[in-house]
């Protein structure tokens, strides 16, 4: 479990940089995080919203905090998610 | 091109109920978040209910709580919005709009009166 | 009663510049970002301004936004008769977890 668990880590935070990117082929990877971040209510994969960069002006709906119920924050003056994906993507690829 | 075409509108007696649906094309609907927002004769626009791309969150204007519901079906790219305890304040043109955050496409609308 | 305040009409003449104010408060503009929406005559609403100052594409440089607080304000220079319509502010209000829009304003030109 152990060894899954740090493959799916090394994974995930070495994808951390394709939310900052601007290519094309990227886009993939951001709309489908985007998705899970509206359906688990998270934010980014390992420092939350700045793992967008730029991005982050792009997208309006990236990580709006649409639950009063949930950990929020500020960020850039708009006000995000706190909880990151990590932990959320963890459990779901477990279950899954 | 996106298109979202209402259908369901029309005339119910206050009390009754009604469906509407909302077929999506020109882009991948499973993707987004989709909404309905609504319009009062001769009134502005009111936010009514979202729903996020795989349905685990649904979201409600006060106005509706309890008496309206916001499903999807993603195999069918169909959004619906099941109108129950209809009021005379509910009347209005019903428009589906993709995403909420913003409404950056809208349908033409279809219109729900309720009266007796 | 809108939660965002706006004026219910402004007007100018061809070629002019017109502002349009849209004020809210920390829960929704302070916090979020601020939406503008065209509906013209008969028709369903436009995306016209995203992001605060953000134009889809299409949509002519002749429209602009800006925000500053609590407030956020649409300015359309080089005014045409076919901006003739209502104009609408939004915002995610994360108080009455909700969306907001202000009241409209009716642009006659």
């Known amino acids: 479990k152990s060894k899954s668990d740090r493959i799916v880590n090394e994974t995930l935070y070495e994808n951390t940089k394709l939310l900052s990117a601007t290519g094309e082929s990227e886009k993939q990877f951001q709309e489908a995080i985007i998705v899970f971040q509206e359906e688990f209510k998270c934010c980014g994969l390992v420092n939350g919203a700045a793992d967008w960069g730029n991005n982050f002006q792009h997208y309006p709906e990236l990580c709006a905090c649409l639950d009063k119920q949930r950990p929020c924050q500020s960020y850039n003056g708009k006000q995000v998610y706190k909880e990151t994906c990590i932990s959320f993507i963890k459990d779901f690829l477990a279950k899954n | 091109e996106v298109q979202l075409l209402e259908s369901g509108g029309g005339l119910v007696q206050p009390g009754g109920s009604l469906r509407l649906s909302c077929a999506a094309s020109?882009?991948?609907?499973?993707?987004?978040?989709m909404s309905w927002v609504r319009q009062a004769p001769g009134k502005g626009l009111e936010w009514v209910s979202a729903?996020?791309?795989?349905?685990?969150?649904?979201y409600y204007a006060d106005s509706v709580k309890g008496r309206f519901t916001i499903s999807r079906d993603n195999s069918k790219n169909t959004l619906y919005l099941q109108m129950n305890s209809l009021r005379a304040e509910d009347t209005a043109v019903y428009y589906c709009?993709?995403?909420?955050?913003?409404?950056?496409?809208w349908g033409q609308g279809t219109l729900v009166t309720v009266s007796s | 009663q809108s939660v965002l305040t706006q004026p219910p009409s402004a007007s100018g003449t061809p070629g002019q510049r017109v502002t349009i104010s849209c004020s809210g408060s920390?829960?929704?503009?302070?916090?979020?970002?601020v939406y503008w929406y065209q509906q013209l005559p008969g028709t369903a609403p436009k995306l016209l301004i995203y992001?605060?100052?953000q134009r889809p594409s299409g949509v002519p440089d002749r429209f602009s936004g800006s925000k500053s607080g609590t407030s956020a304000s649409l300015a359309i220079s080089g005014l045409r008769s076919e901006d003739e319509a209502d104009y609408y502010c939004?915002?995610?209000?994360?108080?009455?977890?909700?969306?907001?829009f202000g009241g409209g304003t009716k642009l006659t030109v």
């Open positions: 920390s829960s929704n503009i302070g916090n979020n970002d």
């Open positions: 709009a993709r995403k909420h955050l913003p409404f950056d496409y």
């Open positions: 939004g915002s995610w209000d994360y108080s009455l977890s909700g969306y907001v």
């Open positions: 992001s605060d100052s």
């Open positions: 020109g882009f991948t609907f499973s993707n987004y978040a």
């Open positions: 729903i996020s791309p795989g349905s685990s969150n649904k």
